[in-house]
């Protein structure tokens, strides 16, 4: 009943709780002397389903048969309507529509750890839409049965709060869950298990690693486990890897030797436990232990390259460059590089340790035969030295690669191709492709990049340190014994028209012609490799088309003569620059009047 129902009653048959699809009879009846005051036969009883009228009747009672009620709760209210007055609420009732519980499925129980408590889970099946009580029973030895009830709306988990111990590990226990509501009851199939079946060990803890004599080859992993653990799974991986190495061990007693770890690598280790070979389940993985393995002496050899620069008649500058060893080759933190420079005929040698750089520059005499050796050192030792004889890399013209080209290959890549040298191509031992940003001043501080290519290759894709809209000077060297030949080309991965034209800084007259001088376009405004400059001129105040002179771009050139100007005529001159993508806007304008005699 939903209110005091002083004026009448609402009765529901067969019950306030019905099975989905059932029919109910609802009766609303007035108590004596509770009708309309003057004309009792004027009583109009109205039945509402929620706020919607579904039936009415004149008299002291109303009967209504209701079908098709939905799952859940439906509210029925009976009201009395008298002439010239508002409807008066008489009484009401809630009807609960649901279903009997389905048989609970997939009942399973687990005890987390030897000191944990038994908890069971199951699948309820479809919602009953009614108050449903679940009772979980656990029967075992000594004729004893534990039970616990759950009165939550959605109950699919219960913890008994009791702990099974391994006094009789083979003793059988049987769990069963029963669901009961007003429409029926249903029990799960019984689940029978032993202590060993349901105890899931706690994950191992207190994981440590030891390296005997600071060596990666003598490594032991230690951990602590619950007392009954028989099996362990170990998994480990470098911290930057997604793939695990897995090891299964039996009766490890909290320790295991690992033999295949890489030096100077941070690893993640995890361990899991199990009580029995084929019963029960594995524990969760332990918390991760992260540890770095010790260093070992470097393996591999440095990739070394060099550049020679003429200083004067007696001296030359040698710049050495080398690439870092890979992590797997360095096998530790590289503390320094050792560079040894030796004059081969006289036997003079000097050694220097370089820290923080991968290059070294020195000045040596132009005479003599020179060699260098470079090695990398960590705390455990040094790599094998890379030895190079210093030679004139471009001296042998017949070894120069032919038809060198450089073409853009997608974003920030340049494909360099060439043909083998005229001289016996089989004499080539390797090609080296070298590239550096083009700087008009020939700046030796510009970083040098290189890659090595096998003698049968005639192309190389360069992508390291390649930026869009920058011009690179690319050289291809063919090396054969103590000889080398080279060819060079300019190339860019992406280009567009230069952002500005050259700035004319001076115009001078010489014997009836003029010499124009200009400042180079700043590198960041060239937008790729420049192909040509154009010099434009026209008579001042003239509307005629300007004349022009196109000159090929050369790095060092910044002046050019013009001898087709008329004396005593004032001209306006300006310049542009071109890449393969187009022409720049024009640079500054300069006026000039040639003072020479007229023809």
């Amino acid at each position: 009943k939903i209110d005091a129902c002083k004026r009448g009653d609402v009765t529901v048959k067969p019950s306030h709780v019905i099975l989905l699809g059932s029919t109910v009879n609802i009766t609303c009846s007035l108590k004596p002397r509770q009708g309309c005051f003057h004309y009792s036969r004027r009583n109009k009883l109205i039945l509402y389903k929620f706020d919607r009228r579904i039936n009415f009747h004149h008299g002291h009672s109303l009967n209504s048969q209701v079908t098709g009620l939905p799952l859940g709760t439906t509210l029925f209210v009976c009201k009395l309507a008298c002439i010239n007055s508002d409807e008066i609420q008489i009484c009401g009732a809630e009807i609960f529509v649901g279903v009997a519980p389905e048989q609970p499925q997939n009942l399973s129980c687990i005890q987390k750890g030897e000191q944990g408590t038994v908890a069971c889970t199951w699948e309820r099946g479809r919602d009953t839409h009614l108050y449903t009580e679940y009772t979980l029973q656990l029967s075992g030895p000594k004729n004893l049965t534990w039970q616990k009830q759950c009165k939550d709306i959605y109950c699919d988990y219960l913890d008994f709060g009791i702990n099974l111990t391994p006094e009789s590990p083979e003793s059988n226990f049987t769990a069963k869950v029963t669901a009961v509501n007003s429409l029926g009851s249903s029990s799960s199939l019984p689940s029978t298990f032993t202590f060993l079946d349901i105890v899931r060990p706690l994950p191992p803890w207190d994981i440590r690693i030891k390296f005997q004599k600071a060596s990666v080859s003598r490594c032991t992993l230690y951990w602590r486990d619950e007392g009954l653990v028989l099996l362990n799974r170990l998994r480990y991986r470098p911290s930057n890897s997604r793939l695990w190495n897995m090891v299964n061990v039996t009766k490890a007693k909290g320790r295991h030797d690992l033999l295949d770890l890489k030096p100077f690598t941070e690893y993640e280790f995890q361990i899991s436990s199990k009580l029995h070979l084929y019963k029960g389940s594995w524990s969760d993985w332990s918390e991760s232990l992260r540890a770095q393995t010790p260093e070992e002496e470097p393996t591999g050899m440095l990739d070394v390259w060099y550049m020679k620069r003429h200083i004067d008649y007696s001296r030359q500058q040698i710049s050495l460059f080398w690439k870092n060893l890979s992590v797997s080759e360095a096998r530790g933190k590289i503390l320094h590089y050792q560079v040894t420079l030796q004059e081969l005929t006289g036997g003079k040698a000097m050694t220097q340790n370089i820290t923080g750089h991968t290059s070294w520059t020195t000045v040596i005499p132009r005479t003599g035969n020179w060699a260098v050796a470079v090695s990398a050192a960590n705390s455990k030792g040094s790599s094998l030295p890379t030895r190079i004889n210093i030679m004139n890399l471009c001296e042998a013209g017949l070894l120069a690669p032919r038809q060198v080209s450089a073409n853009s290959e997608g974003m920030d890549n340049i494909l360099v191709t060439w043909q083998p040298p005229r001289k016996d191509p089989s004499a080539v031992q390797e090609y080296v492709v070298e590239w550096r940003e083009l700087h008009p001043g020939g700046d030796t501080q510009v970083p040098l990049n290189w890659l090595r290519s096998r003698p049968y290759n005639v192309s190389a894709l360069i992508s390291e340190n390649i930026k869009s809209y920058i011009c690179y000077e690319i050289r291809v060297y063919a090396l054969s014994g103590d000889q080398g030949g080279c060819s060079s080309i300019l190339g860019n991965s992406k280009h567009k028209a230069p952002l500005s034209g050259p700035h004319i800084n001076a115009i001078t007259e010489e014997k009836g012609s003029i010499l124009i001088s200009w400042n180079s376009i700043p590198v960041q405004e060239q937008m790729g490799c420049l192909l040509h400059y154009r010099i434009y001129w026209k008579e001042r105040d003239s509307n005629s088309q300007p004349q022009l002179c196109e000159i090929p771009y050369r790095v060092s050139q910044n002046s050019h003569p013009i001898n087709s100007l008329q004396p005593r005529v004032t001209y306006v001159l300006w310049m542009t620059a071109l890449t393969a993508a187009g022409e720049s806007s024009h640079g500054n304008e300069r006026e000039f009047c040639l003072q020479g005699k007229a023809n």
Epitope: L144, Q147, K148, D159, F160, G161, I162, N163, T165, F173
Partner: nanobody, 122 residues
Framework: QLQLVESGGGLVQPGGSLRLSCAAS????????MGWYRQAPGKQRELVAA???????AYADSVKGRFTISRDNAKNTVYLQMNSLKPEDTAVYYC????????????????WGQGTQVTVSS
Amino acid sequence: QLQLVESGGGLVQPGGSLRLSCAASGSIFSINAMGWYRQAPGKQRELVAAITSGGSTAYADSVKGRFTISRDNAKNTVYLQMNSLKPEDTAVYYCNADRDPITSWYVRGDYWGQGTQVTVSS
């Protein structure tokens, strides 16, 4: 120290009912499990019923459906409602309390009461 005092025993005819009470003089909030044991002359003490702080209950097969165990933490009391009593239920009934979680299938209590006699006879 926890003191347990049983009451409610007595003589009853077969089919009759009794309600045993066990009052703890200290707080039973720290007690995980409480139980009723019984010992008939010449027999070993056996667990009749137990209840944990979380509300799990246990019954020996011989009393299942006839006896009900409950606890009232506010009154520091545990009850055993015994219905449909049989002559074989005759024994001294002991109250038991265990501070630790139940560490075995059966209850092994830290604390015991002095016992109350239940006799079922016509």
